[in-house]
């Protein structure tokens, strides 16, 4: 995939972005005590364009998409309390901590923290 | 997929915007002459954000993607003279002209009218 | 829906190569890391290695060490794993699985026989 | 690394019973944060294996409650409350605590 856009040279004014933004996440889990945590969430703005196309078609096919998502992210263990459920008292739930943001390929998926 | 989304509460200061840029669009074939045609192209900044994951799944995985894309084109026919080319002396291609451009759900296909 | 698809059944020659695709779909693919686990005919499960697909980082059991390379391709949400210098022990089903992060194998691909026979 | 000993290799029940595997590991995989880093998988015949159970004691999605898993450190076990016949196949529990992870060597559960 083409590296991201950053600017565009037809809207000089204009620049790409994506933050990681500060959430509070609720998460939960039938029957037991929702926890409320820390979290980032990815939100921007990323550059696309798409240029009309031929057929038969003369050259690649001229569509560009980035899309703000996880630069780096890792899976934490939240434990939840299940009150009146002898068998289960708790629950563990794996939750995607998100570290940083950036524009991607559209295609192209978050990355996760090394093995 | 859901709306694309034109305004964040988070941002409200910021909008997303999709143009159609007019262009000259160079059609080829080889061994034909090239042609100019008046076209447009569709660029812009559209909204994108990914809520993290979690496992075993609460919820439906929170991305959203929208990117700038043609909103309606059709195709039409332009033809190249290929001289020199006895069997082929010309070629018809398919060109599509974009009329009008939109922030639309990344993974759709836009959408063409008939010839 | 989440789907994990390999490549066809492959017949190899002792000393050759082979090399199994596992394509990724209904999931952010890079989200997850990629396992490959073994299974010869009639015999346990045995674990091969495992791949991060955002930055390709891999880790493999010393026995397969020199052997195996395991890539990705984010383009195409495809994982691969090759297997070299075959030889008849290597026959076995072998498995794609996704996981969060370092935890729980939580879908597996339906398998990849290779059969190395002369 | 990480040896798993499962027992018994060989678990002929009766629907409706009761059944329980035992894994153990020759070091401990309870890590510091409190965790037990230890799976259980369920291969039915002609199948690729299915997770029942993660961190020792969570049932996977979609995992009926008849399954329970529990134990720490070195010692665990998968009970089965009441057996059914959906339930046959090779049950295998494995350690994700450190590389390379390894799987125990398997318990065929049949119908008497």
């Known amino acids: 995939a083409p590296p991201p856009i950053n600017k565009l040279a037809l809207f000089p004014d204009k620049s790409a972005w994506c933050e990681a933004k500060n959430i509070t996440q609720i998460v939960g889990h039938s029957g037991c005590e929702a926890k409320s945590i820390q979290n980032r969430a990815c939100l921007g703005q990323c550059f696309s364009y798409s240029v009309p196309n031929t057929f038969p078609q003369s050259t690649e096919s001229l569509v560009h998409c980035d899309s703000c998502m996880p630069a780096q992210s890792m899976w934490e263990i939240v434990t939840l309390e299940c009150p009146g459920h002898e068998e289960v008292p708790r629950v563990d739930k794996l939750v995607e901590k998100i570290v940083h943001c950036s524009c991607q390929a559209c295609g192209k998926e978050p990355s996760h923290e090394g093995l | 997929a859901p709306p694309p989304i034109n305004k964040l509460a988070l941002f409200p200061d910021k909008s997303a915007w999709c143009e159609a840029k007019n262009i000259t669009q160079i059609v080829g074939h080889s061994g034909c002459e090239a042609k100019s045609i008046q076209n447009r192209a569709c660029l812009g900044q559209c909204f994108s954000y990914s809520v993290p994951n979690t496992f075993p799944q609460s919820t439906e995985s929170l991305v959203h993607c929208d990117s700038c894309m043609p909103a309606q084109s059709m195709w039409e026919i332009v033809t190249l003279e290929c001289p020199g080319h006895e069997e082929v002396p010309r070629v018809d291609k398919l060109v599509e002209k974009i009329v009008h451009c939109s922030c639309q759900a990344c993974g759709k296909e836009p959408s063409h009218e008939g010839l | 829906q989440v789907q994990l698809v390999q490549s066809g059944a492959e017949v190899k020659k002792p000393g050759a190569s082979v090399k199994v695709s596992c394509k990724a779909s209904g999931y952010t693919f890079t989200s997850y890391y990629m396992h490959w686990v073994r299974q010869a005919p009639g015999q346990g499960l045995e674990w091969m290695g495992i791949i991060n697909p955002s930055g390709g980082s891999t880790s493999y059991a010393q026995k397969f060490q020199g052997r195996v390379t395991m890539t990705r391709d984010t383009s195409t949400s495809t994982v691969y794993m090759e297997l070299s210098s075959l030889r008849s022990e290597d026959t076995a089903v072998y498995y794609c699985?996704?996981?969060?992060?370092?935890?729980?194998?939580?879908?597996w691909g339906q398998g990849t026989l290779v059969t190395v026979s002369s | 690394d990480v040896v798993m000993t499962q027992s018994p290799l060989s678990l002929p029940v009766t629907p409706g019973e009761p059944a329980s595997i035992s894994c153990r590991s020759s070091q401990s995989l309870l890590k510091s944060n409190g965790y037990n880093y230890l799976d259980w998988y369920l291969q039915k015949p002609g199948q690729s294996p299915q997770l029942l159970i993660y961190?020792?004691?969570n049932r996977a999605s979609g995992v009926p409650d008849r399954f329970s898993g529990s134990g720490s450190g070195t010692d665990f076990s998968l009970k089965i409350r009441r057996v059914e016949a959906e339930d046959v196949g090779v049950y295998y529990c494995?350690?994700?605590?450190?590389?390379?992870?390894?799987f125990g060597q398997g318990t065929k559960l049949e119908i008497k």
């Open positions: 494995m350690q994700t605590l450190q590389t390379p992870y390894t």
């Open positions: 699985a996704r996981a969060p992060g370092k935890f729980p194998l939580d879908y």
């Open positions: 961190l020792g004691s």
